[in-house]
C-alpha cells in the first residue's frame, strides 16, 4: 500500500524516534567503528529517555512537531499512484477470520513490551513478543490455544453460512472467476484473511503509536 | 514503590464463601500476569491461580478448580479471588503475587492475608 | 504432576560460610522454567532466582543458581546474618507450577 513509491513522503517522526537518532549519532561519533548491540542500546536510550527531564525533552518534541508539520504539509500535496486503492472488493459482512493463539497473547503483552521500550518499532515489538511466546511453557499457552481453537470452530460454522448464502455480487465480480476449482477459491480466501488479520494488526499497532504521540 | 496488599482474610465456616483483594501500586498493573500463592501453616507454598493482564484468561490448581473464582479491576489495580464451598484444607495464607513476564516466576509478593476454615 | 524434592530439610551453617542446596525433579525439566525463593519466619517469599541462574535486579550476587535436567542447585557464599532463612525452588514449566518442599537454613 504505497510501501515502494519513492514520492510517499517519509512517514512522521516522534520525540524519542529524535531522541535515539540523537543517541545513535553520538555514539557513532564517540565509536565510529564499534557495532551496535541494538537490544542493549535501545535499553539504555530508553532509560535515559525515562530519567530525561520535561525541559530536556522539550528539544526533542519540538523537532516532532515540526516533523509533524512537515508531513502534514508533504501529505496534502501527495497522490497516490493510480493501482493503490483495494486489490479486491471485502465484503465487509464476511467472517473475520479467527485470530491464532499467538495473535491473542500478543493483544495481552503487547501493550508492556511497548510501555517498557517506548522506542521499539513494530517489527522489534513482534520479535520481543516472538521471543516471550517461544519462552511460554506449553501450559501457559493452553488457554490461547484454547481461545484460539473455540473461535476458530465458530468462524468455520459462520464463513460456511455466508459461503452459503452466496456472496453480494460486487464481491463475485471483484474475486472470484467463475471457472476456479473450489480449492482454489477457498485458498484464495484464506489468504485473502490472513491480509485481513495483517491489516488488523497493523492497524493496532498505528493506533497504540498514536496514542504514544499524544502521551 | 511497588507494593502488593491483600486483604478480605478472616475465619470462615466449612462451606462458606470469602473474597480476597489486593490492591497493587508503583506499576503498571495492566501489564501483568497476576498470580494468588497459598501456604498452610508450616507448610510449604502452592500455587492456586493465575490471571492474565486483560484478565481474559485464568487457570487453577485441580484442588480449587471450580470452587474458587480469579478476576481482576484494571482501573482499579485490583485482583481478587473469590473462594466459595471453602474446606478446612484451604485454611491458609493466601499471597497474591505478580508473575515475571509471562513465566511463573513470581518477583512481588503481597504480605498475605490469613483464611481459617473452621467450624 | 512434576515433584520437586529439596535436601537437605535443615542446613546448619555460620555467617561467613558457603552452603549448597539441591533440588529435584521426578523428571527431566526445562531449566529456563525454574526458580528459587527465600522466605523468612512471618514474611513472604523473595524471588531470587528464576530461569535456573538469572538474578532479579536487588538480589546480591552471593546467591547463585545452576543446574538441568533434574538437578538443581542454589549455593550461598558468604552467608551473612539475613540469609539465615527457608529456601524454597520451584518449577514453572507446567501446571500446577510445583514448589519444592523447603530446606531450612539455620544458623550453627
Known amino acids: 500500500m504505497g510501501k515502494g513509491d519513492p514520492k510517499k513522503p517519509r512517514g512522521k517522526m516522534s520525540s524519542y524516534a529524535f531522541f535515539v537518532q540523537t543517541c545513535r549519532e553520538e555514539h557513532k561519533k564517540k565509536h565510529p567503528d564499534a557495532s551496535v548491540n541494538f537490544s542493549e542500546f535501545s535499553k539504555k536510550c530508553s532509560e535515559r529517555w525515562k530519567t530525561m527531564s520535561a525541559k530536556e525533552k522539550g528539544k526533542f518534541e519540538d523537532m516532532a512537531k515540526a516533523d509533524k508539520a512537515r508531513y502534514e504539509r508533504e501529505m496534502k500535496t501527495y497522490i497516490p499512484p493510480k493501482g493503490e486503492t483495494k486489490k479486491k472488493f471485502k465484503d465487509p459482512n464476511a467472517p473475520k477470520r479467527p485470530p491464532s493463539a499467538f495473535f491473542l497473547f500478543c493483544s495481552e503483552y503487547r501493550p508492556k513490551i511497548k510501555g517498557e521500550h517506548p522506542g521499539l518499532s513494530i517489527g522489534d515489538v513482534a520479535k520481543k513478543l516472538g521471543e516471550m511466546w517461544n519462552n511460554t511453557a506449553a501450559d501457559d499457552k493452553q488457554p490461547y490455544e484454547k481461545k484460539a481453537a473455540k473461535l476458530k470452530e465458530k468462524y468455520e460454522k459462520d464463513i460456511a453460512a455466508y459461503r452459503a448464502k452466496g456472496k453480494p455480487d460486487a464481491a463475485k465480480k471483484g474475486v472470484v472467476k467463475a471457472e476456479k476449482s473450489k480449492k482454489k477459491k477457498e485458498e484464495e480466501e484464506d489468504e485473502e484473511d490472513e491480509e485481513d488479520e495483517e491489516e488488523e494488526e497493523d492497524e493496532e499497532d498505528e493506533d497504540e503509536e498514536e496514542d504514544d504521540d499524544d502521551e | 514503590e511497588v507494593q502488593l496488599l491483600e486483604s478480605g482474610g478472616g475465619l470462615v465456616q466449612p462451606g462458606g464463601s470469602l473474597r480476597l483483594s489486593c490492591a497493587a501500586s508503583?506499576?503498571?498493573?495492566?501489564?501483568?500476569?497476576m498470580t494468588w500463592v497459598r501456604q498452610a501453616p508450616g507448610k510449604g507454598l502452592e500455587w492456586v491461580s493465575s490471571?492474565?493482564?486483560?484478565?481474559?484468561?485464568?487457570s487453577y490448581a485441580d484442588s480449587v478448580k471450580g470452587r474458587f473464582t480469579i478476576s481482576r479491576d484494571n482501573s482499579k489495580n485490583t485482583l481478587y479471588l473469590q473462594m466459595n464451598s471453602l474446606r478446612a484444607e484451604d485454611t491458609a495464607v493466601y499471597y497474591c503475587?505478580?508473575?515475571?513476564?509471562?513465566?511463573?516466576?513470581?518477583?512481588?509478593w503481597g504480605q498475605g492475608t490469613m483464611v481459617t476454615v473452621s467450624s | 504432576d512434576i515433584q520437586m524434592t529439596q535436601s537437605p530439610g535443615t542446613l546448619s551453617l555460620s555467617p561467613g560460610e558457603s552452603g549448597t542446596l539441591s533440588c529435584r525433579a521426578s523428571?527431566?525439566?526445562?531449566?529456563?522454567?525454574f526458580a528459587w525463593y527465600q522466605q523468612k519466619p512471618g514474611q513472604a517469599p523473595r524471588l531470587l532466582i528464576y530461569?535456573?541462574?538469572s538474578r532479579p535486579t536487588g538480589i546480591p550476587d552471593r546467591f547463585s543458581g545452576s543446574g538441568s535436567g533434574t538437578d538443581f542447585t542454589l549455593t550461598l557464599s558468604r552467608l551473612e546474618p539475613e540469609d539465615f532463612a527457608v529456601y524454597f525452588c520451584?518449577?514453572?514449566?507446567?501446571?500446577?507450577?510445583?514448589f519444592g518442599g523447603g530446606t531450612k537454613v539455620e544458623m550453627k
Open positions: 490471571i492474565s493482564p486483560s484478565g481474559g484468561f485464568t
Open positions: 503475587a505478580r508473575d515475571l513476564d509471562i513465566r511463573h516466576a513470581f518477583d512481588i
Open positions: 520451584q518449577y514453572y514449566g507446567s501446571s500446577p507450577y510445583t
Open positions: 530461569g535456573a541462574s
Open positions: 523428571e527431566s525439566v526445562s531449566s529456563r522454567h
Open positions: 508503583g506499576f503498571t498493573f495492566s501489564w501483568y500476569k
